[in-house]
Amino acid sequence: EPPTACREKQYLINSQCCSLCQPGQKLVSDCTEFTETECLPCGESEFLDTWNRETHCHQHKYCDPNLGLRVQQKGTSETDTICTCEEGWHCTSEACESCVLHRSCSPGFGVKQIATGVSDTICEPCPVGFFSNVSSAFEKCHPWTSCETKDLVVQQAGTNKTDVVCGPQDRLR
């Protein structure tokens, strides 16, 4: 990387190195030969998360309930607010600027991974021996009933959407 004129946490202004403002503070005035850099703390609902020479702090993110958002972590003078989605919803992007309803897995599919505030439901097709007869954001594929363990026989084969139907064994006369 190219050489720098100043130390870490300094910046060059008027051929002189001045201290940057620490996180949580903004620049009021550059240093001079006789005075240090003047910084001021960010106001309520504002933040700066790096050593900086910004003259304005950034506004904390607003978690808009109309978009399904709620506060996951309140912002400080050094950190932004972190939003997440209401129960049953998830973020549409990493920045979590809006939410969408968790997808449900259709009959014949089960939930492989339950949705979180930041990821959607992951569905998987029910393999042979398993079924799902509901549209759900929580239900996994269920195993077919084992007729044998109930001393019954299969009267109707199962599918990926239906369980087997068990019935009594035919008695030998």
Epitope: P3, T4, A5, C6, R7, E8, Q10, L12, S15, Q16, C17, C18, S19, C31, T32, E33, T35, E36, T37
Partner: antibody, heavy 126, light 107 residues
Framework: QVQLVQSGAEVKKPGASVKVSCKAS????????MHWVRQAPGQGLEWMGW????????NYAQKFQGRVTMTRDTSISTAYMELNRLRSDDTAVYYC???????????????????WGQGTLVTVSS | DIQMTQSPSSVSASVGDRVTITCRAS??????LAWYQQKPGKAPNLLIY???TLQSGVPSRFSGSGSGTDFTLTISSLQPEDFATYYC?????????FGGGTKVEIK
């Protein structure tokens, strides 16, 4: 008391590399930038660059960019300076020198060297 | 880069003499200047920093002055142990640069 002890003299062929060490004691190694300064025989002082032992950040003089690497091992309070593709005009005494404490400086870089290593003579000759 | 020009390059003086060495920067460096003394085969020794502040343990016969581009190191009464080479160094911005040195010799 503060001490900077450097590795011994080296003789290298042109095109080779040299790595000089500087072991610090008597103070908090991560609290002060470490600089490297060289002095060719009968010549003046030439600044090569610095390393911040706390962050590992470095800053090299343009002249040495791409040829010098400064590193540190905080577990043994030692700074290193490696110079590659040596030429005969790299023959010099290489010094490590301790800067003022981190956070001491508010205006200017105010890099003044209150403690120096004893110097390491690097001779580049075919 | 900031060029530092020292003068004279050498000076012959006697014990008890007042010796003045000047250092000029190619651009303003405020008061960010240091002076070092170096004896043959030894590392430099910090005498003065921020143009006029005496480093701890340095005799008071050494003094520094100046700001901007013109600086002076004065030895008020030269002692036998003061025969050495003196360097100025700007500490305003990187790259740090040194003057070419002034050798103080016995007359």
């Amino acid at each position: 008391q503060v001490q900077l002890v450097q590795s011994g003299a080296e003789v290298k062929k042109p095109g080779a590399s040299v790595k000089v060490s500087c072991k610090a004691s008597g103070y908090t190694f991560t609290g002060y930038y470490m600089h490297w300064v060289r002095q060719a025989p009968g010549q003046g002082l030439e600044w090569m660059g610095w390393i911040n032992p706390d962050s590992g950040g470095t800053n090299y003089a343009q002249k040495f960019q791409g040829r010098v690497t400064m590193t540190r091992d905080t577990s043994i309070s030692t700074a290193y300076m490696e110079l590659n593709r040596l030429r005969s005009d790299d023959t010099a005494v290489y010094y490590c020198a301790r800067d003022q404490p981190l956070g001491y400086c508010t205006n200017g870089v105010c890099s003044y060297f209150d403690y120096w290593g004893q110097g390491t003579l690097v001779t580049v000759s075919s | 880069d900031i060029q530092m020009t020292q003068s004279p390059s050498s000076v012959s003086a006697s014990v008890g003499d007042r010796v003045t060495i000047t250092c000029r920067a190619s651009q303003g460096i405020y008061s960010w200047l240091a002076w070092y003394q170096q004896k043959p085969g030894k590392a430099p020794n910090l005498l003065i920093y921020t143009a006029s502040t005496l480093q701890s343990g340095v005799p008071s016969r050494f003094s520094g002055s100046g700001s901007g581009t013109d600086f002076t190191l004065t030895i008020s009464s030269l002692q036998p142990e003061d025969f050495a080479t003196y360097y100025c160094q700007q500490a305003n911005i990187f790259p740090l640069t040194f003057g070419g040195g002034t050798k103080v010799e016995i007359k």
